[in-house]
Interface confidence: low
């Protein structure tokens, strides 16, 4: 399974949709900026077998899907774009799941890097906590949208590294 090939097109579409979802100028939200501590080291890629790498990517996309599937998200973003974004994420999840099965077989569970997955979970917990504290304000969502765009861009680099490893 050529993971980067199947995944990068969807990643690019998701990034485009995220960009289109922007409703207010980021410059009007500078005071709300926040460092969520993206777990960059987990996306280094050198220490992973491919199945492990896929599981970390899967976790990030699953968490992104969960974040944008909430009631508060539905009340914030333009519904048509949000549905398309969710569609894109779901397609990526399906692709990644198919890749894992191809890599390790249906019966085997890939050797997940639990620490890495936990780091991704905690990253999204910090994002959710920030949104809660900011009472899901438009600026808070704008900051989160920009952060997710950044994390998707970084995961794209991760995929390129995976491709070079092949």
């Amino acid at each position: 399974c050529d993971l980067p090939q199947t995944h990068s097109l969807g990643n690019r579409r998701a990034l485009i949709l995220l960009a289109q979802m922007g409703r207010i100028s980021p410059f009007s939200c500078l005071k709300d900026r926040h460092d969520f501590g993206f777990p960059q080291e987990e996306f280094d890629g050198n220490q992973f077998q491919k199945a492990q790498a896929i599981s970390v990517l899967h976790e990030m996309i699953q968490q992104t899907f969960n974040l944008f599937s909430t009631k508060d998200s539905s009340a914030t973003w333009e519904q048509s774009l949000l549905e398309k974004f969710s569609t894109e994420l779901n397609q990526q999840l399906n692709d990644l799941e198919a890749c894992v099965i191809q890599e390790v077989g249906v019966e085997e569970t890939p050797l997940m890097n639990v620490d890495s997955i936990l780091a991704v979970k905690k990253y999204f917990q910090r994002i959710t906590l920030y949104l809660t504290e900011k009472k899901y304000s438009p600026c808070a969502w704008e900051v989160v949208r920009a952060e997710i765009m950044r994390s998707f861009s970084l995961s794209k680099i991760f995929q390129e590294r995976l491709r070079r490893k092949e």
């Epitope: 599937s69 009631k71 539905s74 009340a75 519904q79 048509s80 549905e83 969710s86 569609t87 397609q91």
Partner: antibody, heavy 119, light 108 residues
């Protein structure tokens, strides 16, 4: 497999209301938006609106905002559409269709309920 | 709202004939969200082509779809009796989602 079950027909009097049902099975009900579509005899299709079964959020086609009310009952995994102040113009087949992911968008439809408005 | 105009409204084709149905949008539609449905009398619509050019599961390879912007088409390379049906184009690029008025395709 995914199934959307709708009653075959409803006969109602002008001015009355009718509540149509769409019972889902074969998938996680709360994971997909449910849509409703109208088709008058020999005519095209009109999108009425959609509901997110997870939290009940609805989006309507402006043309149907005062006509249709979409609801869900998660316990019975059923979506409903109430049509009010019925006239002959509302006589049509009403389909429920499941939203979805890329190739699964509207890939699953109910059989449709024929609503006849007649005195 | 985006109005989708289909032409012709009704057409007849002989077995083996090449058939092209068109769908013209009143304003630009993102090609990823332009779909086609087939409907036979007394049945629900069936997803036929998604994202402009991808055939849904079980759709014969003689069908194809193409287009971009405001102009889309569904083509049958060689008409067969089982293809006689109504075909609707549909967009979910923007709200409200809309369908074309349909083309009824008959077999000669």
């Amino acid at each position: 497999q995914v199934q959307l079950q709708q009653p075959g027909a409803e006969l109602v009097k002008p001015g009355a209301s009718v509540k149509l049902s769409c019972k889902a099975s074969g998938y996680t009900f709360t994971n997909y938006w449910m849509h409703w579509v109208k088709q008058r005899p020999g005519q095209g299709l009109e999108w009425i609106g959609e509901i997110n079964p997870s939290h009940g959020r609805t989006i309507y086609n402006e043309n149907f905002k005062s006509k249709a009310t979409l609801t869900v009952d998660k316990s019975s995994i059923t979506a409903f559409m109430q049509l009010s102040s019925l006239t002959s113009e509302d006589s049509a087949v009403y389909f429920c269709a499941r939203g979805g992911l890329g190739p699964a968008w509207f890939a699953y439809w109910g059989q449709g309920t024929l609503v006849t408005v007649s005195a | 709202q985006i109005v989708l105009t289909q032409s012709p409204a009704i057409m007849s084709a002989s077995p083996g004939e090449k058939v092209t149905l068109t769908c013209s949008a009143g304003s630009s539609v993102d090609s990823s969200y332009l779909y086609w449905y087939q409907q036979k009398p007394g049945s629900s619509p069936k997803l036929w082509i998604y994202s402009t050019s991808n055939l849904a599961s079980g759709v014969p390879a003689r069908f194809s779809g193409s287009g971009s912007g405001t102009s889309y088409s569904l083509t049958i390379s060689s008409m067969e009796a089982e293809d006689a049906a109504s075909y609707f184009c549909h967009q979910w690029s923007s709200y409200p989602f809309t369908f074309g008025s349909g083309t009824k395709l008959e077999i000669k």
